[in-house]
């Protein structure tokens, strides 16, 4: 696949919103352990958001391992419900403005902002530093611009970018989503590359949501954030499919990511479909 091809990825209209996990171990990667047995087990895949089969070696590993598909679903899927987002062109806010505050599963607690749909205003909240959902803004202004009702209806600022001094690449200044684009992949795909706190220089990839491509960066070996992949393919699989551009009734168009300041009104209705 050339990068040109990557730019023209089209996906269906049933993308799920950012993942909300019931238990932190559901985010662990499948770990077969060091032993050599061949045991059929199940794990929750955060990228496909489904419980999947894997071969377990019989010792060690991690908690994201279940004897049965049912047990995995019970522990890691929320009410066994699939959330589908339908798009119309009436109301004003992106769907993620209506999500509840979500601290995520990590414990590096920091102050962030979310739109509180009960009080109809942006408020601060305690964020754990990873995962969570897209109702999560670094600044109050950002939250207000995207989720609060402005004096002239809904206004979206242009998508700010900055040059990252660490790896000399363009990274988003924030998790602000550009007007005609929606991101329904994992929310960490919108975070900047983060070297972390240690002194190693490992080759990793992060998803640069400004240019819509996976780019290399040097990882220090510890800390950082979830936008960190050992291969470009893994990065693309996790993040690339999340970006879509919509036209009128939820149709899709191929796009190169050249973005201009635009005003849009998009409404989202949430439908909860119980798994049969």
């Amino acid at each position: 696949d050339s990068e040109e091809d990557e730019e023209h990825t089209i996906i269906t209209d049933t993308e799920l919103p950012p993942l909300k996990l019931m238990h932190s171990f559901c985010a662990f990667k499948a770990d077969d352990g060091p032993c050599k047995a061949i045991m059929k087990r199940f794990f929750f895949n955060i990228f496909t958001r489904q419980c999947e089969e894997f071969i377990y070696g019989g010792c060690e590993g991690n908690q994201n391992r279940f004897e049965s598909l049912e047990e995995c679903k019970k522990m890691c899927t929320r009410d066994n419900a699939n959330r589908i987002i339908k798009t119309t062109l009436q109301q004003e806010k992106p769907d993620f403005c209506f999500l509840e505050e979500d601290p995520g599963i990590c414990r590096g607690y920091i102050t962030r902002y979310f739109y509180n749909n009960q009080t109809k205003q942006c408020e601060r909240f305690k964020y754990g530093g990873c995962l969570g959902n897209m109702n999560n803004f670094e600044t109050l202004e950002e939250c207000k611009n995207i989720c609060e009702d402005g004096p002239n209806g809904f206004q979206v600022d242009n998508y700010g970018t900055q040059l990252n001094a660490v790896n000399n690449s363009l990274t988003p200044q924030s998790t602000k989503v550009p007007s005609l684009f929606e991101f329904h992949g994992p929310s960490w795909c919108l975070t900047p590359a983060d070297r972390g706190l240690c002194r190693a220089n490992e080759n990793r990839f992060y998803y640069n949501s400004v240019i819509g491509k996976c780019r290399p960066f040097k990882y220090s070996g510890c800390g950082g954030n979830e936008n960190n992949f050992t291969s470009k393919q893994e990065c693309l699989r996790a993040c690339k499919k999340g970006f879509i551009q919509r036209i009128s009734k939820g149709g899709l168009i191929k796009t190169k990511r050249k973005r201009k300041k635009q005003r849009v009104k998009i409404a989202y209705e949430e439908i909860f479909v119980k798994n049969m």
Epitope: Y109, I110, Y113, N116, Q121, E123, R124, L140
Partner: antibody, heavy 119, light 108 residues
């Protein structure tokens, strides 16, 4: 006029619990966070936690999470802080203070409640 | 947690002199989240400066605040008798919210 009026001084034995109150007036109680901060001679000011009465959102300082319980009674616009398993190091002045939902500018404070833990 | 270290612990100056109080953070704190409080004996703390440099209502213009990252400063250009008090820096960028141990500004 915004006012936060705290309950009176307490003398407690080690191992006991204490429940302090903070009655708010002059503003919409449910629209602000209420913080609890204590001041000890050795430790200076220590943030215990905060509660937002409308939705019952609470954030604790991990240091106090197992011993402190924050509650709020919307009907009387009163916030409470209970501290259990008291020890001598908990001897301090305990303050309630309000802040808005967007920052932590603690713009109004109670007068403080002195808690003494002694056998 | 972010530890805020204030220096000096005590500052002895005379009215009319310039006072410089420092607050050093163990990790970087956004300037929007760094506040200062003033406290006088027997009273609760009072919000004094928000967002590093924004003076709270009623705070005289001789006070100013500056800094970024891990280094912040509160400056009083010319001390008045009522300025002698304890000053605390405070951060709410990271949980738990923390305060410095305070700088006591006393009359020389």
């Amino acid at each position: 006029e915004v006012q936060l009026v705290q309950s009176g001084a307490e003398l407690k034995k080690p191992g006991a619990s204490v429940k302090l109150s903070c009655k708010a007036s002059g503003y919409t109680f449910t629209s602000y966070w209420m913080h609890w901060v204590r001041q000890t001679p050795g430790q200076g000011l220590e943030w215990i936690g905060e509660i937002k009465p409308d939705q019952g959102r609470i954030n604790y300082n991990e240091k106090f999470k197992t011993r402190a319980t924050l509650t709020a009674d919307k009907s009387t616009s009163t916030a409470y802080m209970e501290l259990s398993s008291l020890r001598s190091e908990d001897t301090a002045v305990y303050y309630c203070a309000r802040s808005s939902v967007v920052d932590v500018a603690m713009d109004y404070w109670g007068q403080g409640t002195t808690v003494t833990v002694s056998s | 947690e972010i530890v805020l270290t204030q220096s000096p612990a005590t500052l002895s100056l005379s009215p009319g002199e310039r006072a410089t109080l420092s607050c050093s953070a163990s990790s970087s704190v956004s300037s929007s989240y760094l506040y200062w409080y003033q406290q006088k004996p027997g009273q609760a703390p009072r919000l004094w400066i928000s967002g590093t440099s924004i003076l709270a209502s009623g705070v005289p213009a001789r006070f100013s605040g500056s800094g970024s990252g891990t280094k912040y400063t509160l400056t009083i250009s010319s001390l008045e008798p009522e300025d002698f008090a304890v000053y605390f820096c405070h951060q709410w960028s990271h949980y738990p919210f923390t305060f410095g141990q305070g700088t006591k500004l006393e009359i020389k």
